[in-house]
């Protein structure tokens, strides 16, 4: 059997660190057998069998010029093997971050904090941080550790499914290369890392007869579980084309009527979501949707979405805000106290 322990990585490759002494091992001989060493492609002897180093080649203070393939041979000239030297560094603790797009699952991503230059893999696991009793710090078997399954195709991500929203978890990401291993432990709670995906299906429509109104509607992100316990709240921003500043409102449901749009100008609208009890952070903004207020006159017919009549108004009418409604069962929000000098729709 070979005297050379096979490091993790491709066969026939041995590893060392720049600036350090490196020992190469001749794989096809018995431990201690004297061998001769050559650099592949160079005929001069690097180290003879009389070196006293047996089956090993010692390179003092290796540098990048030492990388490459070496040939070892026995006393009678038989090939003992070829060895490729690759230089690099031991792993450093990886950079790890975790995020959750819903309240049941979370994912963690990682990246090396230093480039090792060597073949690298990552071991990922997690456990639930649970204390059995006031005086006990022993771990319960139900707290893990469990593997954190990694995405296929080498994406630097693993996903924990079926997490408990109120529990704390300890994530272990260990970077492994042929020169060692280094671990990063990260404590996470779903509440703090929750960041929903942005709302979907954002639509912006004009309100016929109201040149300063736009009606925006959207849906929950598909990744948010369809259960009523954890709702989302929303933030909506809008601005006219070429206008640098956004106006922000917090709608009560899944739609909002903008009443101070600039007549005749297209408007950009975007929405963001957050857990309704303020866990975690706001989502990124949805892709912008565009709409332009209606330029037509007051409609004669009753619109399909509500029985309306209109009246001219000079002073803004102040309405009581409608009572809050659950986000999952929104109703059209037809009245808004921010109406200014325009036709105001009033409930019949």
């Amino acid at each position: 059997s070979s005297p050379c322990p096979q490091a993790w990585g491709p066969p026939g490759v041995q590893y060392g660190q720049p600036g350090r002494s490196v020992k190469l091992c001749c794989p096809g001989v018995t431990a201690g057998d004297p061998v001769s060493w050559f650099r592949d492609g160079e005929p001069k002897l690097l180290q003879g069998p009389d070196s006293g180093l047996g089956h090993e080649l010692v390179l003092a203070q290796a540098d990048s010029t030492d990388e490459g393939t070496y040939i070892c041979q026995t006393l009678d000239g038989a090939l003992g093997g070829t060895v490729t030297l690759q230089l690099g560094y031991p792993p450093a603790r990886p950079v790890v971050s975790c995020q959750a797009a819903d309240y049941e699952n979370f994912s963690c991503t990682w990246s090396p904090s230093q480039i090792s230059g060597l073949p690298t893999r990552y071991l990922t696991s997690y456990r639930k941080k649970t204390v059995l009793g006031a005086d006990s710090q022993r771990r319960s078997p139900s707290t893990g550790p469990w593997p954190c399954p990694q995405d296929p195709l080498g994406a630097a991500r693993c996903v924990v499914h079926g997490a408990e929203f109120w529990s704390q978890y300890r994530i272990n990401v260990t970077e492994v290369n042929p020169l060692g291993a280094s671990t990063r432990l990260l404590d996470v709670s779903l509440q703090s890392i929750l960041r929903p995906d942005p709302p979907q299906g954002l639509r912006v429509e004009s309100v016929p007869g109201y040149p300063r109104r736009l009606r925006a509607s959207w849906t929950y992100p598909a990744s948010w579980p369809c259960q009523p316990h954890f709702l989302l709240k929303f933030r909506l921003q809008y601005r006219p084309a070429q206008h640098p500043a956004w106006s922000t409102v917090e709608p009560a449901g899944l739609e909002e009527v903008i009443t101070d749009a600039v007549a005749g100008l297209p408007h950009a609208v975007r929405v963001s979501a957050r857990d309704f009890l303020d866990a975690g952070t706001w989502s990124t903004w949805s892709p912008e949707a565009w709409g332009t207020p209606s330029t037509g006159t007051i409609p004669k017919e009753i619109p399909a979405w509500g029985q309306l009549h209109t009246q001219p108004e000079v002073e803004p009418q102040v309405d009581s805000p409608a009572p809050p409604r659950p986000s999952l069962q929104p109703h059209p929000r037809l009245l808004d106290h921010r109406d200014s000098v325009e036709q105001v729709a009033v409930l019949a």
Epitope: S36, K44, L45, G77, A78, L79
Partner: antibody, heavy 117, light 107 residues
Amino acid sequence: QVQLVQSGAEVKKPGASVKVSCKASGYTFTNYWMHWLRQRPGQGLEWIGNIGPSDSKTHYNQKFKDRATLTVDKSTSTAYMELSSLRSEDTAVYYCARGDYVLFTYWGQGTLVTVSS
Amino acid sequence: DIVLTQSPATLSLSPGERATLSCRASQSISNNLHWYQQKPGQAPRLLIKYASQSISGIPARFSGSGSGTDFTLTISSLEPEDFAVYFCQQSYSWPLTFGQGTKLEIK
């Protein structure tokens, strides 16, 4: 015991090619390098090249690089050296030699190649 | 290519005498120099490797020395079978090259 038996003498015309064989026995063929050398009448030795024991990797003397081809047939433990575009100055005894990477420990008996019009 | 120059071209000595053969390299080759003996009608035989390392089966009267550019093969007491041609060979860089030979003849 180690034996390298080369093919018989050849007479070739200028411009022709010659292929010399070297059948090895008495050792594990794929453990050792095979070298090819030649010795012109009354002259010194010239190294043509070598071929690796397991991967058939070759090193050639640039002087022969474009004309010499070294091959092995592992199934019959035979090495071959083909020299093309022969000229009169290629008249020589051609040797195969088992060795390590750079030394020649066991030699064949030699094959005389005569190039003459 | 590294050129090896052997001297003398011919050395005439009697059995029992000490023979000293020289090989000089056109550049420093450390100890990557080897010595061969060739008798008429025979293939060469390896005598010394890496300037001074002996070869199994070669009589102890053959020894080598030197490093860098100057090398010596010494036969401490000549036997009749030692009269032959001696070649040095370098393995410091490709192509592997030989000296032109020293013919050791009986005086």
